[in-house]
């Protein structure tokens, strides 16, 4: 009688993570008597995957009833496949021995490859805000995919970026892989509403790439421009001075009025107006009683924006001239800032 052969008809099997893998194996004879076992890998370090008589293998089921006397089909199904299950599986026939059964013949092996989707890309920006014209770095990470081939692209407001570096780890063979990419983005004053997008394409995604986003509003700081102007006279001895704080982001802002270097009033930006580009404008004004001053008054608008060093703009108020003759710039609306008389 011809010697028993163990036949594994599939050289390779490709399965998506989460699905069930079927590993086929048949024997050509019932003799010698002894069990079939399945292993992953070969040699002394091989891993037992299934033993039909002993051991706990909750993910494995047999395709046919191995207790049937004439059964020669030893195919198995492995459920809930993960990338860690990738490898070469061997169907091995044992013959009865004492004390232990003895390996008799092995199949040629079936290579199980697992396709696993990448995790949703996570985009993270710099820890601290940066101002326009500065270059900032964004990172994008995605994990757990297999096979290794993957494509990553960066976009800013739909426009593809070219200044980035990408690594896929590990370099050698692995059950699954991770991708890490760093992109450099130059900020502009108009970027408050901008988005940076990391897009990952992989064979498991069937042409529908995964995207991770970061809003530049979390990254950018647009410093304000200041303009101090003197408004037309309200009364014979009063001058209205305004400080226009324009095009700033984020909103966190504190303004201090100084009269000849002495703090007159401090307020926090509240009722701001938003510009189309996402930046804010705000105005504060002071009502100055010039009759209380013998000398010229230096009024300073000092602004501390988002915890940064203060910036200021000054205006010299000539007391000697009649208030009505003072030069004035554009009229400003009353934004509801508190009036403050200086006596």
């Amino acid at each position: 009688e011809e010697e028993l052969q163990v036949i594994q008809p599939d050289k390779s099997v490709l399965v998506a993570a989460g699905e069930t893998a079927t590993l086929r194996c048949t024997a050509t004879s019932l003799i010698p008597v002894g069990p079939i076992q399945w292993f992953r890998g070969a040699g002394p370090g091989r891993e037992l995957i299934y033993n039909q008589k002993e051991g706990h293998f909750p993910r494995v089921t047999t395709v046919s009833d191995l207790t049937k006397r004439n059964n020669m089909d030893f195919s198995i199904r492995i459920g809930n496949i993960t990338p860690a299950d990738a490898g070469t599986y061997y169907c091995v026939k044992f013959r009865k021995g004492s004390p232990d059964d003895v390996e008799f013949k092995s199949g040629a092996g079936t290579e199980l490859s697992v396709r696993a989707k990448p995790s949703a890309p996570v985009v993270s920006g710099p820890a601290a805000r940066a101002t326009p014209q500065h270059t900032v770095s964004f990172t994008c990470e995605s994990h757990g995919f297999s096979p290794r081939d993957i494509t990553l692209k960066w976009f800013k407001n739909g426009n593809e970026l070219s200044d980035f570096q990408t690594n896929v780890d590990p370099v050698g063979e692995s059950v699954s892989y991770s991708i890490h990419s760093t992109a450099k983005v130059v900020l502009t004053r108009e970027d408050v509403h901008s988005q940076v997008i990391c897009e990952v394409a992989h064979v498991t995604l069937q042409g529908d790439p995964l995207r991770g986003t970061a809003n530049l509003s979390e990254t950018i700081r647009v410093p304000p421009t200041l303009e101090v102007t003197q408004q037309p006279v309200r009364a014979e001895n009063q001058v209205n001075v305004t400080c226009q704080v324009r095009k700033f982001y984020p909103q966190r802002l504190q303004l201090t009025w100084l009269e000849n270097g002495n703090v007159s009033r401090t307020e926090t930006a509240s009722t701001v107006t938003e510009n189309k580009d996402g930046t804010y404008n705000w105005m504060s004004w002071l009502l100055v009683n010039v009759s209380a001053h013998r000398d010229d008054v230096k009024l300073t608008c000092q602004v501390e924006h988002d915890g940064q060093p203060a910036v200021s703009k000054s205006h010299d108020l000539k007391v000697s001239a009649h208030p009505k003759e003072q030069g004035s710039n554009t009229a400003a609306e009353n934004t509801g800032s508190n009036e403050r008389n200086i006596y």
């Epitope: 370090g45 891993e47 008589k53 051991g55 706990h56 009833d65 207790t67 004390p99």
Partner: antibody, heavy 114, light 108 residues
Framework: QVQLVQSGAEVKKPGASVKVSCKAS????????MHWVRQAPGQGLEWMGR????????KYNPKFQDRVTITVDTSTNTAYMELSSLRSEDTAVYYC???????WGQGTTVTVSS | EIVLTQSPGTLSLSPGERATLSCRAS???????LYWYQQKPGQAPRLLIY???NLASGIPDRFSGSGSGTDFTLTISRLEPEDFAVYYC?????????FGGGTKVEIK
């Protein structure tokens, strides 16, 4: 659900034999081995042997080789363990265990006393 | 036969503490064949971990197993009151099948 129901407690005299039964239900009895494990009072677990119900093939712990016999009756899905020439140190709880090591019988207390 | 030596024999710990139980084999055991059980007084052993590191069904993930060759470890990350019991390692790599002598985890 899977169940292994063992026979009741036994009290035996030294030199006698005891036969403990284990009735299986909820699974294909011939699928896996059936093992027998014992535990003396306050002691650890000791493997005695196993049987392949499909073929009647047995393996025994050399310590018990001459005194233990494991058999099955596939018509009733029952495994048996017989221990002969009992001595006081055979006083123990005897468990039948399915080949997957998940399912254990409730245990049978065998007391050997003169 | 493969002799499994468990240490310590008794481990006295408080709830919330980490327990590390050792099982050393007299000769190499393939990790697929090393199992751990938990046994409480008057009960049959319960399979805890199979193939060195896989949790059996219904076992909380505070239990974990590791090791290879001749050295294996069962770890309980944070002891709960119901974890105080006796733990056994077991090999079925070769005949005769053997169990370790057990480690009793008791309340300090």
């Amino acid at each position: 659900q899977v169940q292994l129901v063992q026979s009741g407690a036994e009290v035996k005299k030294p030199g006698a034999s005891v036969k403990v039964s284990c009735k299986a239900s909820g699974f294909n009895f011939e699928d896996t081995y059936m093992h027998w494990v014992r535990q003396a009072p306050g002691q650890g677990l000791e493997w005695m042997g196993r049987i392949d119900p499909a073929e009647g093939d047995t393996k025994y712990n050399p310590k018990f080789q001459d005194r233990v016999t494991i058999t099955v009756d596939t018509s009733t899905n029952t495994a048996y363990m017989e221990l002969s020439s009992l001595r006081s140190e055979d006083t123990a709880v005897y468990y039948c265990v399915r080949g997957n090591y998940v399912n254990w019988g409730q245990g049978t207390t065998v007391t050997v006393s003169s | 036969e493969i002799v499994l030596t468990q240490s310590p024999g008794t481990l006295s710990l408080s709830p919330g503490e980490r327990a590390t139980l050792s099982c050393r084999a007299s000769s190499s055991v393939s990790s697929s064949y090393l199992y751990w059980y938990q046994q409480k007084p008057g009960q049959a052993p319960r399979l805890l971990i199979y193939s060195t590191s896989n949790l059996a069904s219904g076992i909380p993930d505070r239990f974990s197993g590791s090791g290879s060759g001749t050295d294996f470890t069962l770890t309980i990350s944070r002891l709960e009151p119901e974890d105080f019991a006796v733990y056994y390692c077991h090999q079925w790599y070769s005949y005769p099948r053997t169990f370790g002598g057990g480690t009793k985890v008791e309340i300090k």
